[in-house]
């Protein structure tokens, strides 16, 4: 009888230990949840406030109509310039109209003066045709003014208010372009 009581007491004690463990785990879990909740709320608030204050273009980008432009502060060859733009979720500048060309050249004059800036234009080695990087042809008024004498691949760049061509392996600044965010307000 005594043995039976002592076994029951041990079982009860074991149950109590298990419950204490469970309670400890629950408390720990609750604390972890609260911390995560705090982090999530902070992150959400952060996201919401940045979304609320968000301009159509990222910091250091210039807006014109539906586009955002980034004028680089470093030199690179054409292909590296393209890679740098893609990392920003953009592509090298694709000039669609005379109005856009005027905006770009006007902005460049204010920012940096007369330097060379790669754009997303390259010449097909076989056909000699100029194409934007998405495969479309530039409008007749937006063809590079001079044909480069380079035997290497030839790419387009902007200087002052002209579109020119050069060996793609030369070092220049570059301009990236992405779509501006539409305001949902």
């Amino acid at each position: 009888k005594l043995l039976q009581v002592s076994t029951i007491a041990m079982q009860q004690q074991e149950k109590l230990i298990q419950q204490e463990r469970a309670l400890l785990n629950f408390t720990e879990w609750k604390r972890s949840c609260a911390l995560q909740m705090k982090y999530c709320q902070a992150f959400m608030q952060n996201s919401l406030s940045s979304a609320h204050n968000s301009s159509p273009c990222p910091n250091n980008w210039i807006q014109n109509r539906e586009s955002c432009y980034y004028v680089s502060e470093i030199w690179s060859i054409w292909h590296t310039s393209q890679e740098n733009c893609l990392k920003e979720g953009s592509t090298l500048l694709q000039i669609e109209s005379k109005e856009e060309m005027d905006f770009i050249t006007g902005s460049l004059r204010k920012i940096k003066g007369s330097y060379d800036y790669w754009v997303g234009l390259s010449q097909d080695g076989h056909s000699g045709r100029w194409l934007w990087q998405d495969g479309s042809s530039p409008s007749p008024g937006l063809l590079p003014a001079e044909r480069s004498q380079s035997a290497n691949q030839v790419c387009g760049y902007v200087k002052s208010n002209s579109l020119l061509s050069s060996n793609c392996s030369t070092w220049k600044y570059f301009i990236c372009e992405k779509y501006a965010l539409r305001s949902s307000v």
Epitope: F43, L86, K87, G89, S90, T91, D134, K178
Partner: nanobody, 121 residues
Framework: QVQLQESGGGLVQPGGSLRLSCAAS????????MGWYRQVPGKQRELVAA???????AYADSVKGRFTISRDSAKNTVYLQMNSLKSEDTDVYYC???????????????WGQGTQVTVSS
């Protein structure tokens, strides 16, 4: 960390077509662009085609008019439709994602294992 799973490579005759797919999975905050690169022996990987999160597209000169890149944003998947294939398109094609793992981290390049495309008669 971003994992990229490629599929669709294989052997095809000149003039034929192939469609490559690449699905991104894992934990990441944002993917700015996805695309396809090919490894030219003795050279760096070179861009074949890329598409940004805003839908802008860039192609290599050699594939313009023949290859088409597209994406399914909901599935984080990018496709490369390769038409009018030539023997010079034979290469290992690597999927690439330019992604940020967290909202604080910088954008890095993530690569797939590569899929072989062989154009031969």
């Amino acid at each position: 960390q971003v994992q990229l799973q490629e599929s669709g490579g294989g052997l095809v005759q000149p003039g034929g077509s192939l469609r490559l797919s690449c699905a991104a999975s894992g934990r990441f905050f944002r993917v700015n662009a996805m695309g396809w690169y090919r490894q030219v022996p003795g050279k760096q990987r070179e861009l074949v085609a890329a598409i940004t999160n805003g839908g802008q597209i860039a192609y290599a000169d050699s594939v313009k008019g023949r290859f088409t890149i597209s994406r399914d944003s909901a599935k984080n998947t990018v496709y490369l439709q390769m038409n009018s294939l030539k023997s010079e398109d034979t290469d290992v094609y690597y999927c690439n994602a330019k992604a940020a793992a967290t909202h604080l981290s910088t954008v890095a390049d993530y690569w797939g294992q590569g899929t072989q495309v062989t154009v031969s008669s």
